[in-house]
């Protein structure tokens, strides 16, 4: 039959060439002379000339060595024609399979592989995967089947076999316990890939395994005991810097310290923060310390990390003895602001109050007093006793110095410390009203017609407070009642002035006496301009001229 079985040819054959592979033969050669030819890639098309055929015998020839990794299979067509060129057979398919030789070494995809694993993990933990390729056949032969192995490990601490590699997949895993970043932060493995499933050619590469930090080291105080001196009353004062060491990776959450005052700060006087660069604990005062109340504080500070510990670790504690230093403190008025009620207009030399200060210091310091601010100059203060007395007339109605009945004075106390310190107090004198002002009418100038005059309503004001004000009483004096009447309204806060007899046009004085509810009398002269007119007027009309 005009057929040929697939032909297997090993790659890299050493010849001699041309090498006879198989004979094409048509059974039509009994009837006529047959000429054989081949076509297809490898024969008459690229790569041309790899195969040929002996025209008359039909021997298929290989002209040069084959390379399976370049072309693994050739598909040619065999042709049989008679002397006159007529085809005597259908074209025949010729398959030439190039069989593999182990002519390639494995190649790692990288010269150096990098991976990482957390310190302290259990054996079996995967680290990374390495890959090598081999161009040879791995399906029908072992030529391209790669087996991985670890050739060496550096350093060899704590064991020479900290890692293993899956022979088929190239996955590197931890096999031994004891990975400790603080002792060995990085391992370099020389890895091998060997073809023939481990029995052939070998190539090497490097796998670098970085050991990642776990928070398996506690920060430790160094030193553990501190003594500090702090002036009393200082707020935000740096008391002490506490230093810790931590073997974990610097500037990581496993290294960064967190400080906590565990004891000794009953009054919540202290606070502690972490310095972002040095990792030190900065102990500062949150409130002022009081030497007189407690001159020594013993604090206990515990340190942990931002990250939780991966295992139970003993925490480090520091002891800080804080000595409070005495400071000459300013005297403090008690109370800081004192309210005293006093009658206005009390006689000069009359005592107002005693206003004294206390010195927080335990020494018996002498305190002297003086007035710091007395806007009206109404008061004096005894430097030794703090006795405040009136030296001027306290006037409740003085709008320049008194606001809402209160006269404000600032006083000063000074101790005899070295250097001396001062404290201030505020004395608020609430001035009690005295009936020292009579009622006053407004306005005090009026204009009125002498014919059918309009009644003039005057408002009554009194600077005093109730009950020294309305109801008011009015009385005309000095014969003013001959021409005028004065009547207070029902509410008692206005007076109505009326012209009861004709007066010629001129200016007159009306003598009006007003008294308040406390019978304080005030005489006021009203200037009345009388005009020749009827009813209501604001200014007198000019003289009338006839025409």
């Amino acid at each position: 039959d005009w057929v040929v079985a697939p032909i297997s040819v090993p790659e890299n054959g050493k010849g001699p060439f041309p090498q006879r592979l198989n004979q094409l033969k048509s059974n039509k050669d009994r009837d006529t002379k047959i000429f054989y030819s081949i076509t297809g890639p490898g024969a008459d098309s690229p790569p041309e000339g790899v195969f040929a055929v002996e025209k008359e015998t039909g021997w298929l020839l290989l002209n040069k060595p084959l390379d399976r990794e370049e072309i693994a299979k050739y598909e040619l067509f065999g042709h049989a024609v008679s002397e006159n060129g007529a085809s005597v057979e259908d074209p025949m398919n010729i398959s030439i399979i190039v069989t593999d030789q182990n002519d390639h070494k494995p190649k790692f995809t990288q010269d150096t592989f990098r991976g990482s694993v957390l310190e302290g993990v259990l054996p079996g933990t995967s680290v990374m995967q390495v890959t090598a390729t081999d161009e040879d056949d791995a399906i029908y032969t072992y030529n391209g089947v790669v087996a991985y192995s670890i050739h060496s490990q550096e350093p060899k601490d704590p064991h020479d076999l900290m890692f293993t590699i899956h022979r088929s997949t190239g996955t590197i895993s931890v096999i031994s316990s004891g990975l400790d970043r603080e002792k060995v932060p990085e391992y370099t493995l020389t890895i091998q890939a060997t073809d023939m499933d481990g029995d052939g050619s070998t190539t090497t590469a490097v796998a670098v395994v970085e050991i990642l930090d776990a928070n398996d080291n506690a920060p430790m105080f160094d030193p553990q005991k501190y003594e500090a001196h702090v002036p009393e009353n200082a707020v935000g004062h740096e008391v002490q810097r506490l230093t810790v060491t931590d073997l974990d990776a610097p500037n990581s959450p496993a290294w960064r310290a967190t400080y906590l005052i565990m004891g000794g700060d009953d009054g919540d006087h202290f606070t502690i923060t972490t310095h972002p660069e040095s990792n030190q604990g900065i102990l500062t005062t949150r409130k002022g310390l009081d030497f007189e109340a407690k001159n020594q504080h013993t604090l206990y500070v515990e340190v942990t990390n931002e990250a939780p510990f991966v295992l139970k670790l003993p925490t480090s504690t520091a002891t800080i003895v804080v000595h409070v230093e005495d400071v000459n403190e300013a005297p403090v008025f008690v109370p800081p602001s004192k309210v005293v009620e006093v009658q206005e207009g009390i006689p000069t030399g009359e005592p107002v109050c005693v206003y004294t200060a206390e010195d927080p210091d335990k020494e018996n310091q002498k305190i002297s007093y003086r007035i710091l601010r007395d806007p009206a100059g109404w008061l004096a203060m005894d430097p030794d006793s703090g006795q405040v007395t009136a030296v001027g007339t306290l006037d409740r109605e003085d709008e320049q110095f008194v606001r809402n009945n209160i006269y404000e004075v600032m006083v000063l106390a000074m101790d005899n410390g070295s250097p001396p310190t001062t404290g201030t107090g505020t004395l608020l004198l609430t001035l009690i009203d005295v009936n020292d002002h009579g009622p006053v009418p407004e306005p005090r100038q009026i204009t009125i017609c002498n014919q059918s005059p309009v009644r003039q309503v005057l408002n009554i004001t009194d600077k005093d407070l109730s009950p020294h004000t309305s109801p008011f009483q009015a009385q005309l004096t000095d014969d003013s009642d001959i021409y005028w009447t004065a009547e207070v309204n029902e509410e008692g806060d206005t007076v109505v002035l009326s012209l009861k007899k004709f007066l010629k046009q001129d200016t007159y004085d009306v003598h009006l006496s007003l008294s308040d509810h406390g019978n304080k009398e005030q005489l006021t002269v009203i200037r009345a301009t009388v005009c020749d007119c009827h009813g209501h007027v604001e200014t007198c009309p000019g003289p009338w001229k006839g025409g």
Epitope: L118, E119, G120, V121, L122, P123, G124, T125, S126, P158, H159, D160, L161, T164, H166, R167, S168, T169, T171, S173, I175, S176, S177, G178, D180, A214, D216, V310, L311, K312
Partner: antibody
């Protein structure tokens, strides 16, 4: 020479608790992963739990997960197994074992745990 | 159901040789050369007799030998002696949380 001595076994009712201890000596305890392996009467070896040298990583067999807790105190060279909600099928000899550098185990003599009402 | 498969029992007469097989997968026995064999006498703790397929710890008789082919490891005991009667367990390293797998054990009887 590695020496491991288990203690804490005994008879306990179902649902009860026991705490096994394993005192280690003869090696740098904190550098080695440790395991508990059990063997039910007449049966084979069964991996129960493991803990890394630092104590930061642990492993449990599905059959004990959520009931048993492995821990270690490196300052005392001691391994522990806290066993809660015990069942009849937890009856076994419990061995403490250290994981050697060449994927081998060094074994203690074992302690018997019997769960029965 | 153990991860590694061993015959339940084998037997042999004194002086004879026997072989115990331990079959795993390409992810344990087949992947790593970390197969160990343990001997356990009744009432005793297991004792390591072979590590890394074929390495004997000091003090273990050279009558014990090991080998591996593909996914199967084997323990061979030559010149059987009465004291060899015991249970034998194979174990293999594997990647993952269950980093050590055990075989179901093989009871060796010396006839």
């Amino acid at each position: 020479e590695v020496q491991l001595l288990e203690s804490g076994g005994g008879l306990v009712q179902p649902g009860g608790s026991l705490r096994l201890s394993c005192a280690a000596s003869g090696f740098t305890f904190s550098s080695y992963a440790m395991s508990w392996v059990r063997q039910a009467p007449g049966k084979g070896l069964e991996w129960v739990s493991a803990i890394s040298g630092s104590g930061g990583s642990t492993y449990y067999a599905d059959s004990v997960k959520g009931r048993f807790t492995i821990s270690r105190d490196n300052s005392k060279n001691t391994l522990y197994l806290q066993m809660n909600s015990l069942r009849a099928e937890d009856t076994a000899v419990y061995y403490c074992a250290s994981w050697g550098p060449r994927a081998t185990l060094d074994w203690g003599q074992g302690t018997m745990v019997t769960v029965s009402s | 159901q153990s991860a590694l498969t061993q015959p339940a029992s084998v037997s042999g007469s004194p002086g004879q040789s026997i072989t115990i097989s331990c079959t795993g997968t390409s992810n344990d026995v087949g992947a790593y050369n970390y197969v160990s064999w343990y001997q356990q006498h009744p009432g005793k703790a297991p004792k390591l007799i072979l590590s890394e397929v074929n390495k004997r710890p000091s003090g273990v008789s050279n009558r014990f030998s090991g080998s591996k082919s593909g996914n199967t490891a084997s323990l061979s005991i030559s010149g059987l002696q009465a004291e060899d009667e015991a249970d034998y367990y194979c174990s293999s390293f594997t990647s993952g949380s269950t980093f050590m797998l055990f075989g179901g054990g093989t009871k060796l009887t010396v006839l």
